[in-house]
Each structure stands twice: as C-alpha cells, then as structure tokens.
Interface confidence: low
C-alpha cells in the first residue's frame, strides 16, 4: 500500500484508568497531513465520536479507560501529499496492585517510571502526564508506600515533587495521583515511580535549577513566529550541559532537515553567587504538530517543558 | 514582581450576578493556582476557589452552585462569577497566587480587593 | 470540612509583651499558614508551612505545632505587629481560615 512502516517501543499499561498516545512523528508529520487510528490491522478506522471510550483526538488515540481488552498493536497512519507512513504502536494492559491487596490504599498503578534523586541535593521527581488539549487534569497528589507524602521536605509544584536535602531513606515506591476531566467525566490517574538515590551529582555536582520554562503551556497562533527563552540557575563552576530536546532529541538534531525549530546561541549573566544562564528555543513557523508536544530544557539533570497550545477561539469575533 | 488587580462594579442588586475581573502582571496564569478569597465587613476570610494552570478549577462546596471562576490566558487575566446575590455577599474580594519562591498553596501575592456591596 | 478555631478571638498586650495565638483544627492538618491584615489592607502571608516565615517577617515571630494544635509566637510585641492574625489549612477542601484574632493595644 505503499506506507513506511515505523515501529515504536512497547507501552506497558495499567487497566481502568485513562491512557493517551499522540501520533507525532516529526520530520513526518512537518507538513500538510492527515492522521489515522487503528486497531490491530482493522480497515475501520478508531472512532473520533468523543462520547466514545477509544477515540481519536487530533493526532492522539484517547483511551478512557483502559480495559483488558485493549491490549494489541495499535496503527497510526500518517498520510501527507507525497508521502505514507505506518507507525507500530504495541499496547499491554495488565493489572498492577501498588499496595497490598489487603490494605486499603491506592488503586491500581499505570506506566511505571524510574527516576533518580541525588543524595544531600534538592531534587524533583516528575509526574509524566501526557494528554490532548480535551483532557483537563487537576493537582497532584505524591505517595510513597501507599501513604500520601508529607514533611517540609516535601512540595508538590504543577507536575513536580520537590525533595529537599535528597536522603537514603527516601529511595522506593512513590505515585502521583491525578483526576482527569474530560467531557464532564471524572477520571483518576495514578503513575508509579521507582526511585533510586545516587550519590553522583549530574556532570558538575550542583542541580541547576530552571527558573523558566515551568512545565507550562504557552499559547500561540498557527504559523507565527515564536522564541522561548530557557533561565536556569547554577553555581559558578558547573560543568553542566544546558540544552533542548524533544522526544529526547536534542532539536538541532530533530528537526536537521528542514531547521524549522532551533536552539540558539547560550547566553549568561554572572551573580554573585551564581550565573543566570539563558538558551532559547526558536520556531521560525508554527506547525500544527508542535502543539501538545512538550519541547524539554535541560540543564545537567533537571529538565522542564513547554508546550505549545493554540489559543481559544474568540467568539466575539463572529 | 508580581502583581494582582482586581476589578469590577462596587454595586450589584440582589439576585443578580457578581462578576470580577483579576488582571494580573508579573507571573503568567498558565503556571500555578489562581485564587479568590473574601472578607466579610468584620468578619473573616473565606475561600471561595481557584483556577489552576491547567484550566482545573476547584470551588468552595458552600458556593459551588453558584461560583464560576475562569480565565483568558492571552489577556492574563481571570475571572469570578457569583450568581444569585443577596446581602450575605457583601464583603471586599481578592484574588491571589503563591510563589516559587513559597509552596503554591501560600497565598503570597494578594490583589487589593475590591468591595461589592449587594443592595437595591 | 475541617473547623478552625482561634483562640483568643481578641487580645489586648503592651508592646515588649510575649503573644501567643494558638489555632485548632478539628481534624488533622499536615501544614498550617498564617496571614497578617491591617484594616483596610490585603492579608499579608507572614507563616508558611507552619514554622517558616515570609520575606521581611521579623524573626520575632515564631510557628509550630503539628496535627490539630499549632501555635503563632511574637516574643516581644513591637506597635507594628497589631493586626488581626488568620490561620489557614490548605490539606482538605474546602481550605479554611480561623476566625481570626484582633491583637490590640492595651
């Protein structure tokens, strides 16, 4: 049929709580295209009636929730005016109990993570949330054993817990918890993260701290022009690498061929007990692929997001 | 530094609806909580809700069915709707926000309030 | 919703005085916050997390407690510190405020 076929790792998922794959795939999906879910080689496409529990989003494929059934290969069809591309996406649904059976505590875990926090540093675990624009979370709540987190040590921000002064003790199993909304519909989100404690410090041995992005969302038309800056903290002699990425990528390298999205030139300030750097992000054109992918800035081993949304439509306009 | 202003008429009838206006200069309303918070005349502040960065709002369950609060991010700016007054809404109305340099539930940063009175 | 009661509700004190505002709950609390207001004034955020004071509170001010039972402490009164004084739980929703407590000059 023509179609390059891309196959992605395998998700690991857990039963009864929402779950959101977006079919982005840049350089592809760059230019004028269409995307298409399937399931399993099925000729009809997934549903993008919202009422539906499996939909398609935009480019997204919306489970809410995930039931045992879903498990299977699942086929995002990226078709552009020259161009097909097929990505493979497999699925595993399984039932995770975090806590014990017998006690009564969190429900099920989804995707599980692994994150590091350094030890006698002030560090952050992050809660990986990646939904469409249609799906609206509220705050997060942070366990650890089954028990949700408290202590001075401890502050939840947006999608981040914040540890301060990182100790032995606090290695082990910890989730964050969140209600999704989506069409006036409640939904509970629930990720675990296996943390480890290592006593290595990323590159210089001091953790940045990023005073800008906030993993936050910022909104801007399609087509226009837009530079983000990233402002990261960090001690006069670091050695740490300061940088963006998307998909893990840095965006140099992304978007080589076409040099639609580049990182620009690293400037600094110096403080007195401390330099103020600055390293931005620059969209010469904004595509409708960019919105709701989170564009990383990473300083040694702290890292933020932005994502770009577009804005609500101004009605007073009609 | 951040800064909040609220706004909106001083006077609403009874039955009517209140609505308020907080503009807000400094920070960005797509990160953290967006607050409103009343002072009845000699009396103490009640929570009335928020607004958080992702659009989630959370309203006090005494005024739930009656209290809307939204926003508009490219003006910065959000919202608070109170339907159905009568004189037991009366009180000065503030807006605020945490910080960074605070945990997000401090209330850091507070407008100047505006006083509604609701009379006829 | 959790109930918080301040007591005393009004307090007359010279200046140089040791002050005490203690804050119930009626169900456990993980942190509480205080507020300062002055007539005709915002509240001003003057303790966070139960001990830890906000930019260009003096340090005679002091937080505790844990649970249900925490404290505020001014251990010398200055003419600035009369206000009334708000206590605030953010752990369960609806997020409270105390009643308050009028601090006054005797």
């Known amino acids: 049929d023509g179609c390059n076929d891309i196959f992605m790792k395998n998700e690991m998922l857990s039963a009864s709580q929402p779950f959101a794959f977006n079919c982005t795939f840049p350089p592809i999906t760059s230019g004028e295209v269409s995307v298409t879910w399937y399931k399993n080689s099925s000729k009809i496409p997934v549903s993008k009636i919202i009422q539906s529990r499996i939909h398609q989003d935009e480019t997204w494929i919306l489970f809410l929730p995930m039931e045992w059934g879903d498990s299977g290969v699942y086929q995002c069809v990226i078709k552009g005016r020259d161009s097909c591309h097929r990505i493979h996406v497999n699925l595993t649904v399984f039932e995770k109990q975090w806590c014990d059976t017998s006690v009564k505590g969190l429900p099920n875990l989804s995707d599980e993570y692994k994150q590091i926090l350094h030890l006698g540093k002030d560090d952050s675990l992050t809660c990986h949330l990646h939904f469409p624009k249609s799906c609206i979370l509220g705050p997060i709540k942070w366990y650890k054993d089954c028990n949700e987190i408290t202590g001075e040590r401890f502050t939840v921000l947006e999608t981040r817990l914040l540890v301060s002064n990182v100790s032995a003790e606090d290695r082990g199993n910890y989730a964050c918890q969140v209600i999704l909304t989506h069409s006036g519909k409640q939904y509970e989100v629930l990720n675990g993260i296996t943390v480890s404690i290592t006593e290595r410090a990323g590159y210089g041995g001091s953790v940045p701290k990023i005073i800008y992005p906030k993993n936050n969302s910022i909104e801007v038309q399609l087509g226009t022009t837009l530079i983000v800056d990233c402002n990261i903290t960090d001690t006069k002699d670091n050695t740490n690498l300061r940088c963006w990425r998307v998909n893990n990528t840095l965006v140099d390298d992304y978007y080589n061929e076409s040099k639609r999205i580049r990182e620009g030139v690293e400037t600094h300030a110096s403080f007195r007990e401390y330099n103020l750097y600055t390293v931005n992000i620059t969209f010469l054109e904004v595509k409708m692929e960019d919105y709701g992918l989170p564009f990383m800035c990473h300083a040694g081993v702290s890292a933020a997001y932005i994502m770009l949304q577009l804005p609500a439509p101004d009605f007073r306009a009609y | 530094q951040v800064q909040l202003q609220e706004s909106g008429p001083g006077l609403v009838k009874p039955s009517q609806t209140l609505s308020l206006t907080c503009t807000v200069s400094?920070?960005?309303?797509?990160?953290g909580y967006w607050n409103w918070i009343r002072n009845h005349p000699g009396k103490g502040l009640e929570y009335i809700?928020?607004?958080?960065?992702?659009?989630?709002?959370y309203y006090n369950p005494s005024l739930k069915s009656r209290v809307t609060i939204s926003r508009d991010t490219s003006k910065n700016q959000y919202y608070l709707k109170l339907s159905s007054v009568t004189a037991a809404d009366t009180a000065v109305y503030y807006c605020?926000?945490?910080?960074?340099?605070?945990?997000?539930?401090?209330?850091?940063?507070w407008g100047q309030g505006t006083l509604v009175t609701v009379s006829s | 919703d959790i109930q918080m009661t301040q007591s005393p509700s009004s307090l007359s004190a010279s200046v140089g005085d040791r002050v005490t505002i203690t804050c119930r709950a009626s169900?456990?609390?993980?942190?509480m916050y205080w507020y300062q207001q002055k007539p005709g004034k915002a509240p001003k955020l003057w303790i966070y997390?139960?001990?830890n004071l906000a930019s260009g509170v003096p340090s005679r001010f002091s937080g505790s407690g844990s649970g249900t039972s925490y404290t505020l402490t001014i251990s010398s009164l200055q003419p600035e510190d009369f206000a009334t004084y708000y206590c605030?739980?953010?752990?369960?929703?609806?997020?409270?405020f105390g009643q308050g407590t009028k601090l006054e000059i005797k």
């Open positions: 400094g920070a960005s309303i797509t990160s």
């Open positions: 809700g928020y607004i958080y960065y992702s659009g989630y709002t």
């Open positions: 169900s456990n609390v993980r942190y």
């Open positions: 997390l139960t001990s």
């Open positions: 605030q739980q953010f752990t369960t929703s609806p997020y409270t």
């Open positions: 605020a926000t945490g910080g960074y340099d605070y945990v997000e539930d401090a209330l850091y940063y």
